[in-house]
């Protein structure tokens, strides 16, 4: 995640990023909407890797928890919202079937708008 | 990616998402800033999987290519910018060493602001 502040810029929504291990994640939602268990270890050629995920979400302590920064408030209501993407992970479904599935993880914080209705 | 439009909302920045294969991606940048080759297939317990990535970027054809939607233009300049995250991928570095590395992929389109200076 390149930091806009380094270029003298501000984000419309403040976010936080962190590394999360499968040990802490435990479960996730797959592409079909089912809950799956995220396995801690991935077998690789002759060994194991820890499953790690880089997650980004809206900063609940940030300035923008009340609404997005820089919005024209006369015409718009705004809200910072965490959005998700898909990454492949080694998982186990409810029937104990282990396999590589795409799971949803938090990857961004974006601003959504709704038009202000006339009073 | 949940669709804000379904809830009568608009995004400050328009984005497009697509599935990209390693065959199309070919190379990527790893966490240390080095360019690596993304391998097309990943060996799994019963064969091989194609490496796929779910990528989201700013829509170059969208309304927001000239600036973000809903911004207070009296005080702010704005720009929609594609941001990146990290996902693990099977890659080969410049020394032909194959391994699982975190690579950067496009995951979102966010709005960045700069303050308008007094004329």
């Amino acid at each position: 995640h390149s930091d806009p502040a380094r270029r003298g810029e501000l984000s419309v929504c403040d976010s936080i990023s962190e590394w999360v291990t499968a040990a802490d994640k435990k479960t996730a939602v797959d592409m079909s909407g089912g809950t799956v268990t995220v396995l801690e270890k991935v077998p690789v050629s002759k060994g194991q890797l820890k499953q790690y995920f880089y997650e980004t979400k809206c900063n609940p302590m940030g300035y923008t928890k009340e609404g997005c920064r820089g919005i024209d408030k006369r015409h718009w209501n705004s809200q910072c919202r965490t959005t998700q993407s898909y990454v492949r992970a080694l998982t186990m479904d409810s029937k104990k079937r282990i396999g590589w599935r795409f799971i949803r993880i938090d990857t961004s914080c974006v601003c959504t708008l709704t038009i202000k209705r006339g009073r | 990616h949940s669709d804000p439009a379904r809830r009568g909302e608009l995004s400050v920045c328009d984005s497009i998402s697509e599935w990209v294969t390693a065959a199309d991606k070919k190379t990527a940048v790893d966490m240390s800033g080095g360019t690596v080759t993304v391998l097309e297939k990943v060996p799994v317990s019963k064969g091989q999987l194609k490496q796929y990535f779910y990528e989201t970027k700013c829509n170059p054809m969208g309304y927001t290519k000239e600036g973000c939607r809903g911004i207070d233009k009296r005080h702010w300049n704005s720009q929609c910018r594609t941001t990146q995250s990290y996902v693990r991928a099977l890659t080969m570095d410049s020394k032909k060493r194959i391994g699982w590395r975190f690579i950067r992929i496009d995951t979102s389109c966010v709005c960045t602001l700069t303050i308008k200076r007094g004329r």
Epitope: E18, W19, T21, G47 | -
Partner: antibody, heavy 119, light 108 residues
Framework: DVQLVESGGGVVRPGESLRLSCAAS????????MNWVRQAPGEGLEWVSA????????YYADSVKGRFTISRDNSKNTLYLQINSLRAEDTAVYYC????????????WGLGTLVTVSS | EIVLTQSPATLTVSPGERATLSCRAS??????LAWYQQKPGQAPRLLIY???TRATGIPARFSGSGSGTEFTLTISSLQSEDFAVYYC??????????FGGGTKVEIK
């Protein structure tokens, strides 16, 4: 700068307990799995225990299983090791070590705290 | 558990000479091996990970090679500050993580 400072060591009798602490600074503590590694006087390094970033996964060497408990308080940026039923063979310098994101090895170590078990 | 055997136990070398340290694994650890340096009274310091990648701030005279079961740490031209004990560590199969017994590099 990353800093890890252990405390809580001392001279104890066999069968007694101790709680070691490791105060971390200079990095986002919750993003890293943390480990304890010990070194008996004049001997090599022995891995003791590990804990995932948010505490969801804990791991122990067979030699300490059931007697040692690893924990962390991310709000205080502190790692702990509760040591019960101490034995003479537990005499060692106990190091707190930060696990890298790149793999399960240790990119930063504390200076250690000495635990001496003697009757 | 995977056993790592380091040899020699002690290596006596003159400053400016090349030092070659060996680490052998009881089974393949792929390239999942790290090397550390430890000086008396100090904590270990990461030198190499992934069998051959130098950690941040480590001088180019340190290099790692090997994969599978045979690994080598080479110090191309020993400086006075390089006299220390060196440990290898595997992270291919865990828990437990395991360390080698160490090689002490002494001044001739």
């Amino acid at each position: 700068d990353v800093q890890l400072v252990e405390s809580g060591g001392g001279v104890v009798r066999p069968g007694e307990s101790l709680r070691l602490s490791c105060a971390a600074s200079g990095f986002t503590f919750k993003n890293h799995d943390m480990n304890w590694v010990r070194q008996a006087p004049g001997e090599g390094l022995e891995w003791v225990s590990a804990i995932s970033g948010r505490g969801g996964g804990t791991y122990y060497a067979d030699s300490v299983k059931g007697r040692f408990t690893i924990s962390r308080d991310n709000s205080k940026n502190t790692l702990y090791l509760q040591i019960n039923s101490l034995r003479a063979e537990d005499t060692a310098v106990y190091y707190c070590a930060r696990e890298s994101i790149w793999g399960i090895f240790f990119d930063y170590w504390g200076l250690g705290t000495l635990v001496t078990v003697s009757s | 558990e995977i056993v790592l055997t380091q040899s020699p136990a002690t290596l006596t070398v003159s400053p400016g000479e090349r030092a070659t340290l060996s680490c052998r694994a009881s089974q393949s650890v792929s390239s999942n091996l790290a090397w550390y340096q430890q000086k008396p009274g100090q904590a270990p310091r990461l030198l190499i990970y992934g069998a051959s990648t130098r950690a941040t701030g480590i001088p180019a005279r340190f290099s790692g090679s090997g994969s599978g079961t045979e690994f080598t740490l080479t110090i191309s031209s020993l400086q006075s500050e390089d006299f220390a004990v060196y440990y290898c560590q595997q992270y291919n199969n865990w828990p437990p993580l395991t360390f080698g017994g160490g090689t002490k590099v002494e001044i001739k």
